[in-house]
Protein backbone atom coordinates (compact mmCIF):
# COMPACT_ATOMS: atom_id res chain seq x y z
CA UNK A 1 0.00 0.00 0.00
CA UNK A 2 1.00 3.57 -0.62
CA UNK A 3 2.31 5.65 2.30
CA UNK A 4 1.64 9.39 2.45
CA UNK A 5 3.09 11.71 5.09
CA UNK A 6 1.14 14.75 6.20
CA UNK A 7 1.72 17.76 8.43
CA UNK A 8 -0.54 18.64 11.32
CA UNK A 9 -2.72 21.61 10.34
CA UNK A 10 -1.99 21.17 6.63
CA UNK A 11 -4.07 19.77 3.79
CA UNK A 12 -3.33 16.45 2.12
CA UNK A 13 -4.69 14.95 -1.07
CA UNK A 14 -5.01 11.16 -1.29
CA UNK A 15 -5.29 10.08 -4.91
CA UNK A 16 -7.46 7.35 -6.33
CA UNK A 17 -7.75 6.73 -10.04
CA UNK A 18 -10.16 4.64 -12.06
CA UNK A 19 -8.93 2.93 -15.22
CA UNK A 20 -11.72 4.52 -17.25
CA UNK A 21 -11.68 8.28 -17.55
CA UNK A 22 -15.33 8.81 -16.62
CA UNK A 23 -17.52 9.61 -13.67
CA UNK A 24 -18.28 6.45 -11.73
CA UNK A 25 -19.30 5.39 -8.23
CA UNK A 26 -16.55 5.61 -5.61
CA UNK A 27 -16.20 5.62 -1.84
CA UNK A 28 -13.47 6.53 0.57
CA UNK A 29 -13.56 4.66 3.88
CA UNK A 30 -11.42 4.58 6.99
CA UNK A 31 -9.87 1.44 8.47
CA UNK A 32 -13.10 0.85 10.43
CA UNK A 33 -14.86 0.65 7.04
CA UNK A 34 -16.90 3.72 7.96
CA UNK A 35 -17.68 5.85 4.92
CA UNK A 36 -15.94 9.22 4.74
CA UNK A 37 -17.19 10.38 1.37
CA UNK A 38 -18.50 9.08 -1.89
CA UNK A 39 -20.61 9.84 -4.92
CA UNK A 40 -24.37 9.41 -5.07
CA UNK A 41 -25.68 10.28 -8.50
CA UNK A 42 -23.84 13.52 -9.22
CA UNK A 43 -23.56 14.54 -5.60
CA UNK A 44 -20.80 14.16 -3.05
CA UNK A 45 -22.09 12.50 0.08
CA UNK A 46 -20.36 12.35 3.45
CA UNK A 47 -20.44 9.54 5.94
CA UNK A 48 -20.34 9.95 9.74
CA UNK A 49 -16.56 9.52 10.11
CA UNK A 50 -14.53 12.00 12.14
CA UNK A 51 -13.42 13.55 8.85
CA UNK A 52 -16.95 14.50 7.77
CA UNK A 53 -16.37 18.26 8.09
CA UNK A 54 -12.77 18.21 6.82
CA UNK A 55 -12.89 15.82 3.87
CA UNK A 56 -13.66 16.82 0.29
CA UNK A 57 -13.10 15.74 -3.29
CA UNK A 58 -12.30 17.53 -6.55
CA UNK A 59 -15.62 17.14 -8.37
CA UNK A 60 -14.09 18.75 -11.47
CA UNK A 61 -11.77 15.75 -11.88
CA UNK A 62 -14.38 12.99 -11.49
CA UNK A 63 -15.08 12.77 -15.22
CA UNK A 64 -11.35 12.18 -15.74
CA UNK A 65 -11.50 9.16 -13.44
CA UNK A 66 -9.75 10.96 -10.58
CA UNK A 67 -11.46 10.44 -7.23
CA UNK A 68 -9.08 12.02 -4.77
CA UNK A 69 -9.90 12.76 -1.15
CA UNK A 70 -8.70 16.05 0.29
CA UNK A 71 -8.36 16.24 4.08
CA UNK A 72 -8.02 19.73 5.53
CA UNK A 73 -6.58 20.81 8.87
CA UNK A 74 -4.85 17.48 9.47
CA UNK A 75 -4.71 16.06 12.99
CA UNK A 76 -2.33 13.40 14.33
CA UNK A 77 -5.34 11.14 14.93
CA UNK A 78 -6.17 11.29 11.20
CA UNK A 79 -3.29 8.86 10.76
CA UNK A 80 -5.02 5.75 9.42
CA UNK A 81 -5.32 3.45 6.46
CA UNK A 82 -7.83 4.89 4.01
CA UNK A 83 -9.56 2.74 1.42
CA UNK A 84 -10.75 3.98 -1.94
CA UNK A 85 -13.35 1.70 -3.55
CA UNK A 86 -13.83 2.25 -7.24
CA UNK A 87 -14.62 -0.11 -10.17
CA UNK A 88 -14.79 -3.13 -7.84
CA UNK A 89 -11.22 -2.59 -6.72
CA UNK A 90 -9.81 -1.29 -3.46
CA UNK A 91 -6.83 1.00 -3.15
CA UNK A 92 -5.26 1.44 0.27
CA UNK A 93 -3.36 4.55 1.34
CA UNK A 94 -1.65 4.80 4.70
CA UNK A 95 -1.63 8.36 5.96
CA UNK A 96 0.82 9.29 8.70
CA UNK A 97 0.40 12.75 10.17
CA UNK A 98 3.25 14.41 12.05
CA UNK A 99 3.50 17.62 13.99
CA UNK A 100 6.66 19.46 15.00
CA UNK A 101 6.45 22.20 17.56
CA UNK A 102 8.73 24.21 19.79
CA UNK A 103 7.65 23.23 23.29
CA UNK A 104 8.17 26.75 24.57
CA UNK A 105 7.82 30.19 23.09
CA UNK A 106 9.64 30.52 19.76
CA UNK A 107 11.02 33.86 21.00
CA UNK A 108 13.95 32.85 23.16
CA UNK A 109 16.77 34.71 24.83
CA UNK A 110 20.31 34.14 23.68
CA UNK A 111 21.79 31.32 25.74
CA UNK A 112 18.44 29.69 26.42
CA UNK A 113 17.67 26.20 25.15
CA UNK A 114 15.28 25.28 22.39
CA UNK A 115 13.43 21.96 22.37
CA UNK A 116 11.50 20.79 19.33
CA UNK A 117 9.00 18.00 19.95
CA UNK A 118 7.68 15.67 17.29
CA UNK A 119 4.09 14.50 17.53
CA UNK A 120 3.66 11.24 15.68
CA UNK A 121 1.06 8.51 15.29
CA UNK A 122 1.33 5.40 17.48
CA UNK A 123 3.47 2.67 15.94
CA UNK A 124 5.52 5.02 13.79
CA UNK A 125 9.27 5.34 14.20
CA UNK A 126 10.29 8.57 12.50
CA UNK A 127 13.67 10.26 12.48
CA UNK A 128 14.13 14.03 12.51
CA UNK A 129 16.93 16.15 11.10
CA UNK A 130 16.95 19.92 11.63
CA UNK A 131 19.10 22.57 10.01
CA UNK A 132 19.51 25.97 11.64
CA UNK A 133 19.64 29.20 9.62
CA UNK A 134 23.38 29.22 10.25
CA UNK A 135 23.78 25.73 8.77
CA UNK A 136 24.06 23.78 12.01
CA UNK A 137 22.69 20.20 11.67
CA UNK A 138 20.96 18.46 14.59
CA UNK A 139 19.43 14.99 14.57
CA UNK A 140 17.03 13.32 16.93
CA UNK A 141 13.98 11.17 17.49
CA UNK A 142 10.87 12.44 19.28
CA UNK A 143 12.74 15.48 20.63
CA UNK A 144 15.52 17.69 19.37
CA UNK A 145 17.37 19.94 21.77
CA UNK A 146 19.60 22.94 21.12
CA UNK A 147 21.16 23.63 24.53
CA UNK A 148 22.40 27.20 24.03
CA UNK A 149 20.90 29.39 21.37
CA UNK A 150 23.17 31.82 19.63
CA UNK A 151 22.36 35.02 17.77
CA UNK A 152 22.90 33.27 14.43
CA UNK A 153 20.24 30.66 15.31
CA UNK A 154 17.58 33.30 14.66
CA UNK A 155 15.52 32.64 11.57
CA UNK A 156 13.82 29.72 9.89
CA UNK A 157 14.78 26.22 11.01
CA UNK A 158 14.12 23.51 8.43
CA UNK A 159 13.33 20.10 9.88
CA UNK A 160 12.86 16.95 7.84
CA UNK A 161 10.85 14.06 9.28
CA UNK A 162 11.53 10.70 7.65
CA UNK A 163 9.39 7.56 7.83
CA UNK A 164 9.26 4.60 5.43
CA UNK A 165 11.61 6.30 2.94
CA UNK A 166 9.20 9.23 2.76
CA UNK A 167 9.90 12.71 4.07
CA UNK A 168 7.92 15.72 5.19
CA UNK A 169 9.46 19.13 5.81
CA UNK A 170 8.65 21.54 8.62
CA UNK A 171 9.72 25.15 8.86
CA UNK A 172 9.84 26.75 12.30
CA UNK A 173 10.63 30.40 12.82
CA UNK A 174 12.84 30.97 15.84
CA UNK A 175 13.59 34.45 17.12
CA UNK A 176 16.66 34.75 19.32
CA UNK A 177 16.21 37.79 21.51
CA UNK A 178 19.58 39.51 21.62
CA UNK A 179 21.40 42.71 20.80
CA UNK A 180 23.00 42.85 17.36
CA UNK A 181 26.44 42.90 18.93
CA UNK A 182 27.64 41.19 22.06
CA UNK A 183 30.19 43.93 22.61
CA UNK A 184 31.14 47.26 21.10
CA UNK A 185 33.88 49.80 21.75
CA UNK A 186 33.64 53.53 21.24
CA UNK A 187 36.90 55.46 20.78
CA UNK A 188 36.77 59.18 21.57
CA UNK A 189 39.05 62.15 22.11
CA UNK A 190 38.69 63.90 25.41
CA UNK A 191 35.84 66.39 25.35
CA UNK A 192 34.00 64.85 22.41
CA UNK A 193 30.36 63.81 22.65
CA UNK A 194 29.91 60.04 22.94
CA UNK A 195 27.09 58.14 21.24
CA UNK A 196 26.28 54.62 22.43
CA UNK A 197 23.86 52.61 20.29
CA UNK A 198 22.33 49.26 21.23
CA UNK A 199 20.46 47.93 18.18
CA UNK A 200 18.36 44.79 18.69
CA UNK A 201 18.79 41.74 16.50
CA UNK A 202 15.03 41.17 16.27
CA UNK A 203 11.77 43.02 15.80
CA UNK A 204 8.66 42.49 17.88
CA UNK A 205 5.33 44.16 17.37
CA UNK A 206 5.06 45.02 21.03
CA UNK A 207 8.28 45.51 22.89
CA UNK A 208 7.95 46.20 26.58
CA UNK A 209 10.47 45.87 29.38
CA UNK A 210 13.01 47.70 31.48
CA UNK A 211 16.73 48.18 31.33
CA UNK A 212 19.80 49.53 33.06
CA UNK A 213 23.35 50.52 32.20
CA UNK A 214 25.95 49.63 34.81
CA UNK A 215 29.35 51.24 34.38
CA UNK A 216 32.75 50.22 35.66
CA UNK A 217 35.10 53.14 35.19
CA UNK A 218 38.74 52.16 34.89
CA UNK A 219 39.65 54.56 37.65
CA UNK A 220 36.78 53.52 39.98
CA UNK A 221 36.91 50.73 42.51
CA UNK A 222 33.29 49.63 41.95
CA UNK A 223 30.65 49.74 39.27
CA UNK A 224 27.80 52.19 39.27
CA UNK A 225 24.36 52.38 37.71
CA UNK A 226 24.42 55.19 35.19
CA UNK A 227 20.83 55.01 33.97
CA UNK A 228 17.63 52.97 34.34
CA UNK A 229 14.81 53.12 31.82
CA UNK A 230 11.49 51.61 30.79
CA UNK A 231 10.42 50.41 27.38
CA UNK A 232 6.73 50.43 26.53
CA UNK A 233 5.59 49.55 23.03
CA UNK A 234 8.98 50.61 21.66
CA UNK A 235 8.84 53.95 23.51
CA UNK A 236 11.74 54.65 25.87
CA UNK A 237 11.35 56.59 29.11
CA UNK A 238 14.15 57.30 31.57
CA UNK A 239 13.46 56.34 35.17
CA UNK A 240 16.65 57.38 36.89
CA UNK A 241 19.96 58.85 35.74
CA UNK A 242 23.15 59.75 37.65
CA UNK A 243 24.18 63.38 38.02
CA UNK A 244 27.71 62.65 36.86
CA UNK A 245 27.77 61.82 34.02
CA UNK A 246 24.36 63.12 32.98
CA UNK A 247 23.44 60.71 30.20
CA UNK A 248 20.71 61.44 27.71
CA UNK A 249 18.59 58.73 26.15
CA UNK A 250 16.68 58.61 22.87
CA UNK A 251 12.92 58.09 23.09
CA UNK A 252 12.76 55.59 20.23
CA UNK A 253 14.46 52.34 19.31
CA UNK A 254 17.27 51.50 18.78
CA UNK A 255 18.32 52.24 22.35
CA UNK A 256 20.57 55.25 22.14
CA UNK A 257 22.60 56.94 24.87
CA UNK A 258 24.55 60.19 24.68
CA UNK A 259 27.39 61.13 27.00
CA UNK A 260 27.96 64.89 26.65
CA UNK A 261 31.74 64.64 27.06
CA UNK A 262 34.33 61.89 26.90
CA UNK A 263 36.48 62.31 29.98
CA UNK A 264 39.23 60.04 31.32
CA UNK A 265 37.20 59.38 34.49
CA UNK A 266 34.40 57.89 32.36
CA UNK A 267 36.64 55.56 30.39
CA UNK A 268 35.83 51.95 31.17
CA UNK A 269 33.25 49.34 30.34
CA UNK A 270 29.53 49.10 30.81
CA UNK A 271 26.89 46.41 30.68
CA UNK A 272 23.46 47.30 29.32
CA UNK A 273 20.79 44.83 30.41
CA UNK A 274 17.28 44.66 29.07
CA UNK A 275 14.57 42.59 30.74
CA UNK A 276 11.63 41.94 28.42
CA UNK A 277 8.10 41.52 29.69
CA UNK A 278 6.97 37.88 30.01
CA UNK A 279 10.51 36.61 29.43
CA UNK A 280 12.79 35.09 31.99
CA UNK A 281 16.36 36.29 31.77
CA UNK A 282 17.89 39.44 30.32
CA UNK A 283 19.53 40.63 27.15
CA UNK A 284 23.07 41.91 27.59
CA UNK A 285 25.39 44.11 25.60
CA UNK A 286 28.83 45.13 26.73
CA UNK A 287 30.04 48.57 25.75
CA UNK A 288 33.52 50.01 26.17
CA UNK A 289 34.68 53.58 26.13
CA UNK A 290 38.30 54.45 25.29
CA UNK A 291 39.29 58.09 25.80
CA UNK A 292 42.39 59.73 24.35
CA UNK A 293 44.14 62.85 25.61
CA UNK A 294 47.17 64.60 24.07
CA UNK A 295 48.87 67.28 26.20
CA UNK A 296 51.98 69.41 26.15
CA UNK A 297 53.43 70.37 29.48
CA UNK A 298 56.72 72.26 29.49
CA UNK A 299 59.16 70.20 27.37
CA UNK A 300 57.01 67.07 27.45
CA UNK A 301 54.46 66.03 24.80
CA UNK A 302 52.28 63.19 26.15
CA UNK A 303 49.56 61.05 24.63
CA UNK A 304 47.47 58.84 26.89
CA UNK A 305 44.49 56.51 26.51
CA UNK A 306 42.13 55.30 29.21
CA UNK A 307 39.74 52.44 29.08
CA UNK A 308 39.80 48.81 27.99
CA UNK A 309 42.38 48.43 25.23
CA UNK A 310 43.88 45.22 24.02
CA UNK A 311 47.63 44.72 24.59
CA UNK A 312 48.20 44.50 20.85
CA UNK A 313 47.00 48.06 20.21
CA UNK A 314 49.72 50.54 19.34
CA UNK A 315 49.88 54.09 20.58
CA UNK A 316 52.06 56.42 18.48
CA UNK A 317 53.16 60.01 18.47
CA UNK A 318 54.40 61.46 15.22
CA UNK A 319 55.10 64.78 13.63
CA UNK A 320 52.91 65.48 10.62
CA UNK A 321 54.34 64.17 7.34
CA UNK A 322 57.06 62.28 9.19
CA UNK A 323 57.36 58.71 10.36
CA UNK A 324 56.45 57.67 13.88
CA UNK A 325 58.67 59.33 16.36
CA UNK A 326 57.57 57.07 19.16
CA UNK A 327 55.38 54.02 19.05
CA UNK A 328 54.55 51.58 21.84
CA UNK A 329 52.11 48.88 22.79
CA UNK A 330 51.28 50.89 25.87
CA UNK A 331 48.64 53.25 27.24
CA UNK A 332 50.89 56.29 27.25
CA UNK A 333 53.67 57.62 25.00
CA UNK A 334 55.63 60.84 25.25
CA UNK A 335 58.27 62.88 23.46
CA UNK A 336 60.69 65.15 25.29
CA UNK A 337 61.52 68.50 23.67
CA UNK A 338 59.23 67.96 20.66
CA UNK A 339 59.86 69.79 17.43
CA UNK A 340 57.44 72.55 16.59
CA UNK A 341 54.59 71.54 14.28
CA UNK A 342 51.39 69.53 14.20
CA UNK A 343 51.73 66.28 16.10
CA UNK A 344 49.42 63.33 15.77
CA UNK A 345 48.61 60.84 18.47
CA UNK A 346 47.33 57.60 16.91
CA UNK A 347 45.77 54.54 18.48
CA UNK A 348 45.90 51.74 15.94
CA UNK A 349 45.25 48.06 15.55
CA UNK A 350 47.41 46.30 12.94
CA UNK A 351 47.79 49.52 10.97
CA UNK A 352 44.12 50.50 11.21
CA UNK A 353 43.68 53.81 13.00
CA UNK A 354 41.05 53.63 15.72
CA UNK A 355 41.51 57.06 17.21
CA UNK A 356 43.63 60.11 16.49
CA UNK A 357 44.19 63.40 18.23
CA UNK A 358 46.16 66.36 16.88
CA UNK A 359 48.12 68.77 19.01
CA UNK A 360 50.07 71.79 17.82
CA UNK A 361 53.49 72.30 19.35
CA UNK A 362 54.55 75.92 19.13
CA UNK A 363 58.29 76.83 19.04
CA UNK A 364 59.72 77.90 22.38
CA UNK A 365 62.09 80.92 21.97
Amino acid sequence: KKVVLGKKGDTVELTCNASQKKNTQFHWKNSNQIKILGIQGLFLTKGPSKLSDRADSRKSLWDQGCFSMIIKNLKIEDSDTYICEVENKKEEVELLVFGLTANSDTHLLEGQSLTLTLESPPGSSPSVKCRSPGGKNIQGGRTISVPQLERQDSGTWTCTVSQDQKTVEFKIDIVVLAFQKASSTVYKKEGEQVEFSFPLAFTLEKLTGSGELWWQAERASSSKSWITFDLKNKEVSVKRVTQDPKLQMGKKLPLHLTLPQALPQYAGSGNLTLALEAKTGKLHQEVNLVVMRATQFQENLTCEVWGPTSPKLTLSLKLENKGATVSKQAKAVWVLNPEAGMWQCLLSDSGQVLLESNIKVVPTW
Partner: antibody, heavy 120, light 107 residues
Framework: QVQLQESDPGLVKPSETLSLTCTVS????????WSWIRQPAGKGLEWIGR???????NYNPSLKSRVTMSVDTSKNQFSLKLSSVTAADTAVYYC??????????????WGQGTTVTVSS | DIQMTQSPSSLSASVGDRVTITCQAS??????LNWYQQKPGKAPNLLIY???NLETGVPSRFSGSGSGTDFTFTISSLQPEDIAAYYC?????????FGQGTRLEIK
Protein backbone atom coordinates in the same frame (compact mmCIF):
# COMPACT_ATOMS: atom_id res chain seq x y z
CA GLN B 1 -19.76 3.55 33.13
CA VAL B 2 -20.58 6.63 31.08
CA GLN B 3 -23.83 8.40 31.91
CA LEU B 4 -25.49 11.38 30.27
CA GLN B 5 -27.79 13.92 31.87
CA GLU B 6 -29.72 16.59 29.99
CA SER B 7 -30.61 19.86 31.71
CA ASP B 8 -34.29 20.72 32.12
CA PRO B 9 -35.36 23.90 30.30
CA GLY B 10 -39.07 23.22 30.89
CA LEU B 11 -41.26 25.73 29.12
CA VAL B 12 -39.88 27.89 26.29
CA LYS B 13 -41.83 30.73 24.66
CA PRO B 14 -42.29 30.85 20.88
CA SER B 15 -39.56 32.79 18.99
CA GLU B 16 -37.18 32.36 21.95
CA THR B 17 -34.01 30.27 21.98
CA LEU B 18 -34.05 26.82 23.51
CA SER B 19 -30.85 26.01 25.44
CA LEU B 20 -29.92 22.52 26.61
CA THR B 21 -26.79 21.15 28.22
CA CYS B 22 -25.73 17.53 28.47
CA THR B 23 -23.32 16.56 31.25
CA VAL B 24 -21.11 13.53 30.72
CA SER B 25 -20.12 11.61 33.86
CA UNK B 26 -18.08 8.44 34.37
CA UNK B 27 -15.92 9.11 31.31
CA UNK B 28 -14.23 11.74 29.20
CA UNK B 29 -15.92 13.85 26.56
CA UNK B 30 -12.75 13.59 24.42
CA UNK B 31 -12.41 11.36 21.34
CA UNK B 32 -16.13 11.01 20.65
CA UNK B 33 -18.88 12.68 18.73
CA TRP B 34 -21.90 13.64 20.82
CA SER B 35 -25.36 13.87 19.24
CA TRP B 36 -28.66 15.54 19.97
CA ILE B 37 -31.84 13.70 18.92
CA ARG B 38 -35.43 14.77 19.48
CA GLN B 39 -38.77 12.97 19.50
CA PRO B 40 -42.14 14.73 19.38
CA ALA B 41 -44.81 12.95 21.47
CA GLY B 42 -45.97 9.74 19.78
CA LYS B 43 -43.67 10.30 16.80
CA GLY B 44 -40.29 9.08 15.51
CA LEU B 45 -36.69 10.10 16.20
CA GLU B 46 -35.06 13.06 14.47
CA TRP B 47 -31.28 13.59 14.51
CA ILE B 48 -30.49 17.27 15.19
CA GLY B 49 -26.73 17.12 14.83
CA ARG B 50 -23.47 16.21 16.53
CA UNK B 51 -20.36 17.82 17.95
CA UNK B 52 -16.86 16.45 18.41
CA UNK B 53 -14.73 17.15 21.48
CA UNK B 54 -12.61 19.51 19.32
CA UNK B 55 -15.70 21.58 18.53
CA UNK B 56 -16.30 20.46 14.94
CA UNK B 57 -19.99 20.01 14.15
CA ASN B 58 -22.43 18.43 11.71
CA TYR B 59 -26.03 19.62 11.68
CA ASN B 60 -29.17 18.25 10.10
CA PRO B 61 -29.78 20.53 7.06
CA SER B 62 -33.46 20.82 8.02
CA LEU B 63 -32.49 22.59 11.27
CA LYS B 64 -29.04 23.99 10.39
CA SER B 65 -30.09 27.65 10.22
CA ARG B 66 -31.38 27.53 13.80
CA VAL B 67 -28.92 25.18 15.51
CA THR B 68 -25.70 25.95 17.38
CA MET B 69 -23.76 23.32 19.30
CA SER B 70 -20.82 23.89 21.60
CA VAL B 71 -18.60 21.85 23.88
CA ASP B 72 -16.87 22.60 27.18
CA THR B 73 -14.27 19.89 27.76
CA SER B 74 -13.25 21.36 31.12
CA LYS B 75 -16.79 20.78 32.44
CA ASN B 76 -17.35 17.58 30.42
CA GLN B 77 -20.45 19.16 28.89
CA PHE B 78 -21.86 19.84 25.46
CA SER B 79 -24.75 22.13 24.61
CA LEU B 80 -27.50 22.73 22.10
CA LYS B 81 -29.10 26.05 21.20
CA LEU B 82 -32.16 26.10 18.96
CA SER B 83 -33.32 29.59 18.01
CA SER B 84 -36.72 30.95 16.92
CA VAL B 85 -38.64 28.01 18.38
CA THR B 86 -42.27 27.24 17.52
CA ALA B 87 -44.77 24.70 18.83
CA ALA B 88 -43.34 22.23 16.27
CA ASP B 89 -40.15 22.10 18.35
CA THR B 90 -42.05 20.64 21.33
CA ALA B 91 -40.46 17.23 21.94
CA VAL B 92 -38.36 15.06 24.21
CA TYR B 93 -34.71 16.01 23.57
CA TYR B 94 -32.02 13.34 24.01
CA CYS B 95 -28.28 13.62 24.10
CA UNK B 96 -26.25 10.57 23.08
CA UNK B 97 -22.70 9.36 22.54
CA UNK B 98 -21.74 8.33 19.01
CA UNK B 99 -19.28 5.47 18.92
CA UNK B 100 -17.27 4.28 15.95
CA UNK B 101 -15.79 0.82 15.60
CA UNK B 102 -15.21 -1.69 12.84
CA UNK B 103 -18.25 -1.30 10.56
CA UNK B 104 -19.88 0.20 13.63
CA UNK B 105 -21.34 3.64 14.07
CA UNK B 106 -24.06 3.96 16.62
CA UNK B 107 -25.44 5.90 19.54
CA UNK B 108 -24.50 3.54 22.31
CA UNK B 109 -25.14 5.71 25.38
CA TRP B 110 -28.19 7.94 25.78
CA GLY B 111 -29.45 10.44 28.32
CA GLN B 112 -32.88 9.80 29.82
CA GLY B 113 -34.32 12.69 27.77
CA THR B 114 -35.81 16.03 28.77
CA THR B 115 -39.24 17.30 27.77
CA VAL B 116 -39.29 20.71 26.12
CA THR B 117 -42.61 22.45 25.66
CA VAL B 118 -42.89 25.52 23.45
CA SER B 119 -45.85 27.55 24.53
CA SER B 120 -46.73 31.15 25.33
CA ASP C 1 -31.10 13.05 2.69
CA ILE C 2 -31.64 9.31 2.76
CA GLN C 3 -35.26 8.37 3.55
CA MET C 4 -35.86 5.29 5.68
CA THR C 5 -39.24 3.62 5.36
CA GLN C 6 -40.27 1.08 8.00
CA SER C 7 -43.13 -1.36 7.82
CA PRO C 8 -45.41 -2.10 9.41
CA SER C 9 -45.92 1.04 11.48
CA SER C 10 -47.43 -1.11 14.21
CA LEU C 11 -47.98 -4.81 14.79
CA SER C 12 -49.53 -7.09 17.36
CA ALA C 13 -48.10 -10.53 18.08
CA SER C 14 -48.27 -13.25 20.71
CA VAL C 15 -45.54 -14.36 23.09
CA GLY C 16 -43.35 -16.92 21.32
CA ASP C 17 -44.19 -15.62 17.85
CA ARG C 18 -41.59 -14.82 15.22
CA VAL C 19 -41.78 -11.12 14.46
CA THR C 20 -40.32 -9.44 11.37
CA ILE C 21 -39.94 -5.72 10.66
CA THR C 22 -38.60 -4.36 7.37
CA CYS C 23 -36.78 -1.17 6.57
CA GLN C 24 -36.15 0.26 3.14
CA ALA C 25 -33.59 2.93 2.28
CA SER C 26 -34.18 5.45 -0.51
CA UNK C 27 -30.71 4.64 -1.88
CA UNK C 28 -27.96 2.04 -1.45
CA UNK C 29 -26.57 2.23 2.07
CA UNK C 30 -24.49 -0.96 1.90
CA UNK C 31 -24.65 -2.46 5.42
CA UNK C 32 -24.66 0.85 7.28
CA LEU C 33 -27.83 0.23 9.26
CA ASN C 34 -28.64 0.05 12.97
CA TRP C 35 -31.73 -1.15 14.81
CA TYR C 36 -32.84 0.46 18.10
CA GLN C 37 -35.40 -0.57 20.68
CA GLN C 38 -37.29 2.09 22.65
CA LYS C 39 -39.38 1.04 25.60
CA PRO C 40 -42.21 3.38 26.73
CA GLY C 41 -40.87 6.48 28.53
CA LYS C 42 -37.25 5.42 27.99
CA ALA C 43 -34.39 6.37 25.69
CA PRO C 44 -33.62 4.19 22.66
CA ASN C 45 -31.19 1.28 23.05
CA LEU C 46 -28.90 0.00 20.26
CA LEU C 47 -29.58 -3.66 19.44
CA ILE C 48 -28.01 -4.34 16.05
CA TYR C 49 -25.29 -2.53 14.10
CA UNK C 50 -23.98 -2.94 10.55
CA UNK C 51 -27.26 -4.60 9.55
CA UNK C 52 -26.60 -7.95 11.21
CA ASN C 53 -24.23 -7.59 14.17
CA LEU C 54 -25.62 -8.01 17.66
CA GLU C 55 -24.57 -5.33 20.15
CA THR C 56 -22.89 -6.74 23.28
CA GLY C 57 -25.38 -7.85 25.94
CA VAL C 58 -28.34 -8.07 23.55
CA PRO C 59 -30.28 -11.39 23.63
CA SER C 60 -29.69 -13.67 20.64
CA ARG C 61 -33.41 -13.82 19.77
CA PHE C 62 -32.86 -10.48 18.04
CA SER C 63 -31.26 -10.58 14.59
CA GLY C 64 -30.90 -8.48 11.48
CA SER C 65 -30.13 -9.01 7.82
CA GLY C 66 -29.99 -7.21 4.51
CA SER C 67 -27.74 -5.00 2.45
CA GLY C 68 -28.11 -2.19 -0.07
CA THR C 69 -31.66 -0.87 0.29
CA ASP C 70 -33.65 -3.68 1.95
CA PHE C 71 -33.23 -4.74 5.56
CA THR C 72 -35.03 -7.02 7.96
CA PHE C 73 -35.18 -7.13 11.76
CA THR C 74 -36.38 -10.33 13.41
CA ILE C 75 -37.34 -11.42 16.91
CA SER C 76 -37.27 -15.23 16.75
CA SER C 77 -39.47 -15.77 19.82
CA LEU C 78 -41.33 -12.75 21.18
CA GLN C 79 -41.02 -12.15 24.93
CA PRO C 80 -43.26 -9.88 27.05
CA GLU C 81 -40.31 -7.51 27.72
CA ASP C 82 -39.96 -6.92 23.97
CA ILE C 83 -42.96 -4.59 23.98
CA ALA C 84 -41.43 -1.42 22.53
CA ALA C 85 -41.03 0.71 19.45
CA TYR C 86 -38.27 -0.35 17.02
CA TYR C 87 -36.38 2.04 14.77
CA CYS C 88 -33.95 1.51 11.92
CA UNK C 89 -31.24 4.14 11.40
CA UNK C 90 -28.83 4.60 8.51
CA UNK C 91 -25.25 5.79 8.98
CA UNK C 92 -24.12 5.64 5.37
CA UNK C 93 -24.42 9.41 4.88
CA UNK C 94 -25.03 12.53 6.88
CA UNK C 95 -27.54 13.57 8.03
CA UNK C 96 -28.19 10.43 10.03
CA UNK C 97 -31.83 9.44 9.49
CA PHE C 98 -34.23 7.10 11.29
CA GLY C 99 -37.22 5.14 10.10
CA GLN C 100 -40.57 6.33 11.41
CA GLY C 101 -40.68 3.39 13.83
CA THR C 102 -42.69 0.22 14.38
CA ARG C 103 -44.82 -0.19 17.51
CA LEU C 104 -44.92 -3.74 18.75
CA GLU C 105 -47.60 -4.89 21.15
CA ILE C 106 -48.64 -8.24 22.59
CA LYS C 107 -51.98 -9.73 21.63
Amino acid sequence: QVQLQESDPGLVKPSETLSLTCTVSGGSISSYYWSWIRQPAGKGLEWIGRIYASGSTNYNPSLKSRVTMSVDTSKNQFSLKLSSVTAADTAVYYCARDREGYYYYGMDVWGQGTTVTVSS
Amino acid sequence: DIQMTQSPSSLSASVGDRVTITCQASQDISKYLNWYQQKPGKAPNLLIYAASNLETGVPSRFSGSGSGTDFTFTISSLQPEDIAAYYCQQYDSLPITFGQGTRLEIK
